[in-house]
């Protein structure tokens, strides 16, 4: 092996006959936690105007909504479906969509996703037709 | 012959500037995404920057946002990436590397889809 071949490609080598591909990370939204307008629809955009490239190869994309008596806040980031989220597993990981699911929370109305193709949770969805209630 | 080549690395005091440089040839570079990557020294690889082949969208990771700036000129087939504000963990190699139409894959790292690297050492 040459001597300036990077090291430690570790999980993220695939094998193959070219002696492996290295998988590329996902392209996230990612402003954390953000004020919202996104209220009573069956889909929304995040409007956040920064899309990360993740830390990982194997991280994917995730947003949060969230709505309590003082506001309504969207969370967008890239996260290990692995890891819990917000005390959560993230469902639906390998979705190309990010399709809202409630959560059991005290004091507010949670929802989350997680999907895994570029952007995704720049478009988050809450319709009935995917999922069984939408916020309020 | 495809070929990647890294040039304008080298030693920088911290809060320094360098501009890295990636020539490519033997390949139609306005087809092909273009990343830069690092390796810092017992590290695995850190995806720095991407930058669309037309349209010149760029990406960054959340480390480096604000600081480094990857850009394309198509007409000499060469990828740049200037790096502000460096500091002592920004030390690493940096490759460039072209991503394979269509997929979230590049080829393995010692194939022609990634240069030699160059190296950058920041540090009083």
């Known amino acids: 092996i040459p001597p300036h071949v990077p090291k430690s490609v570790n999980s993220d080598v695939m094998a193959s006959d070219n002696g492996g591909a290295v998988k590329l990370p996902q392209l996230c939204k990612f402003c954390d936690v953000r004020l919202s307008t996104c209220d009573n629809q069956k889909s929304c955009m995040s409007n956040c105007s920064i899309t990360a490239i993740c830390e990982k190869p194997h991280e994917v994309c995730v947003a949060v909504w969230r709505k309590n008596d003082k506001n309504i806040t969207l969370e967008t980031v890239c996260h290990d479906p692995k890891l819990t989220y917000h005390g959560f597993t993230l469902e639906d990981a390998a979705s190309p969509k990010c399709v809202m699911k409630e959560k059991k929370r005290a004091g507010e109305t949670f929802f989350m996703c997680a999907c895994n193709m570029e952007e995704c949770n720049d478009y988050i969805i809450f319709s009935e037709e995917y999922t069984t209630s939408s916020p309020d | 012959e495809v070929q990647l080549l890294e040039s304008g690395g080298g030693l920088v005091q911290p809060g320094g500037s360098l501009r890295l440089s990636c020539t490519a040839s033997?390949?139609?570079?306005?087809?092909?995404r273009m990343w830069w990557v690092r390796q810092a020294p017992g590290k695995g690889l850190e995806w720095v920057s991407?930058?669309?082949?037309?349209?010149?969208?760029?990406y960054y990771a959340n480390s480096v946002r604000g600081r480094f700036t990857i850009s394309r000129d198509n007409s000499k087939n060469t990828l740049y990436l200037q790096m502000n504000s460096l500091r002592a963990e920004d030390t690493a190699v940096y490759y460039c590397?072209?991503?394979?139409?269509?997929?979230?894959?590049?080829?393995?790292?010692?194939?022609?889809?990634w240069g030699q690297g160059t190296q950058v050492t920041v540090s009083s």
């Open positions: 590397a072209k991503q394979i139409p269509g997929h979230m894959w590049t080829a393995n790292p010692r194939s022609d889809y």
């Open positions: 033997g390949f139609t570079f306005t087809e092909y």
């Open positions: 991407l930058i669309e082949p037309i349209g010149n969208r760029t």
